[in-house]
Interface confidence: medium
C-alpha cells in the first residue's frame, strides 16, 4: 500500500507512518514503528504540556515571583500552566501577569470610583460639586458636603472638591 501523506486528528506523520500524538500532560519518548505504539511519559511535578503533542520536553510551570508582587492564583497541573496574579494592593502590568505595579491612590479632590483588583488599577473620579475628598487614598470615595441646614446651622465657609463646608450658628437679629 502507498505510504500516507496525511494523518488523522491526534496523529502525526513520521517515516511515512502515522503515529499517535501524546495526550496533554505527557511528552514523547519514542515514535511509533510498524510494530510498536508511540511511547509517552507523564510530565514531571513542575512541568506541563497542554495539547496533544510530539514534544520531547515538557514546559516548566510559570514561577510567581513574590519579589515582583506575584502570587499563585491557580496551581499548575500536568496539563495546565500555573496562573499568577498580584498580591492585594497591586495589579498586573499585562494580561500574562508577568509583574505587578502598586495600585495608585486618588489625590485630594478625587475619589475612588472603583477599588483596584488583581488585574485592574484604582479608578479615580473628580469629586463633583457638593462632594469632596481631602486625602490621598486608594479606598476613599468622594463624600457629600455636610448639610448645615439639617443641623440648624448656616454655611460659614463654602465647600470645595477638597474640603467640606464649615457650618456655623445662624445670626440672631435683635429687635
Amino acid at each position: 500500500p502507498e505510504p500516507p501523506t496525511a494523518c488523522r486528528e491526534k496523529q502525526y506523520l513520521i517515516n511515512s507512518q502515522c503515529c499517535s500524538l501524546c495526550q496533554p500532560g505527557q511528552k514523547l519518548v519514542s515514535d511509533c514503528t510498524e510494530f510498536t505504539e508511540t511511547e509517552c511519559l507523564p510530565c514531571g511535578e513542575s512541568e506541563f504540556l497542554d495539547t496533544w503533542n510530539r514534544e520531547t520536553h515538557c514546559h516548566q510551570h510559570k514561577y510567581c515571583d513574590p519579589n515582583l508582587g506575584l502570587r499563585v492564583q491557580q496551581k499548575g497541573t500536568s496539563e495546565t500552566d500555573t496562573i499568577c496574579t498580584c498580591e492585594e494592593g497591586w495589579h498586573c502590568t499585562s494580561e500574562a501577569c508577568e509583574s505587578c505595579v502598586l495600585h495608585r491612590s486618588c489625590s485630594p479632590g478625587f475619589g475612588v470610583k472603583q477599588i483596584a483588583t488583581g488585574v485592574s488599577d484604582t479608578i479615580c473620579e473628580p469629586c463633583p460639586v457638593g462632594f469632596f475628598s481631602n486625602v490621598s487614598s486608594a479606598f476613599e470615595k468622594c463624600h457629600p458636603w455636610t448639610s448645615c441646614e439639617t443641623k440648624d446651622l448656616v454655611v460659614q465657609q463654602a465647600g470645595t472638591n477638597k474640603t467640606d463646608v464649615v457650618c456655623g450658628p445662624q445670626d440672631r437679629l435683635r429687635a
Partner: nanobody, 121 residues
C-alpha cells in the same frame, strides 16, 4: 519610627467574638489607608479588610463579609477589627498594616508583629 502594635487575640469558641486593636505611631495616622491581613498556619498572607483615612469607606474579603467590621479612631491613632460569628477557618495570625504609598514588593509598607486568633472548641 513607624510602629504598629496589635492586641486582642486569643482562644475563642466557634460562633464567638473578639475585638482586635492596633495602636499606630511614627506616621500621620489620619491620612493613611489601613488594612487587616491574616496568615493561617501553613498558608500565605490573605487580605481581610481595608479602611479609608477618614473611616468612611470600608472593604471586606468575601470570606469575612457580614461577620467582621473594620473601624478606626483617628483621635487615638488606633485601628480596630470586630470579629463576630468566628469559624475555625478564621484561625490565623492577624496583622495590622499601613497601605503602601510607594512601590515595593508588597502592598503594605509597614505591618505589626501580629496577634494570634485561635477558633476552636
Amino acid at each position: 519610627e513607624v510602629q504598629l502594635l496589635e492586641s486582642g487575640g486569643g482562644l475563642v469558641q466557634p460562633g464567638g467574638s473578639l475585638r482586635l486593636s492596633c495602636a499606630a505611631s511614627g506616621f500621620t495616622f489620619n491620612v493613611a489607608d489601613m488594612q487587616w491581613v491574616r496568615q493561617a498556619p501553613g498558608k500565605g498572607l490573605e487580605w481581610v479588610s481595608s479602611i479609608s483615612p477618614n473611616g468612611w469607606d470600608t472593604y471586606y474579603a468575601d470570606s469575612v463579609k457580614g461577620r467582621f467590621t473594620i473601624s478606626r479612631d483617628n483621635s487615638k491613632n488606633t485601628l480596630y477589627l470586630q470579629m463576630n460569628s468566628l469559624r475555625a477557618e478564621d484561625t490565623a495570625v492577624y496583622y495590622c498594616a499601613k497601605h503602601a504609598s510607594t512601590e515595593g514588593p508588597t502592598a503594605f509598607d509597614y505591618w505589626g508583629q501580629g496577634t494570634l486568633v485561635t477558633v476552636s472548641s
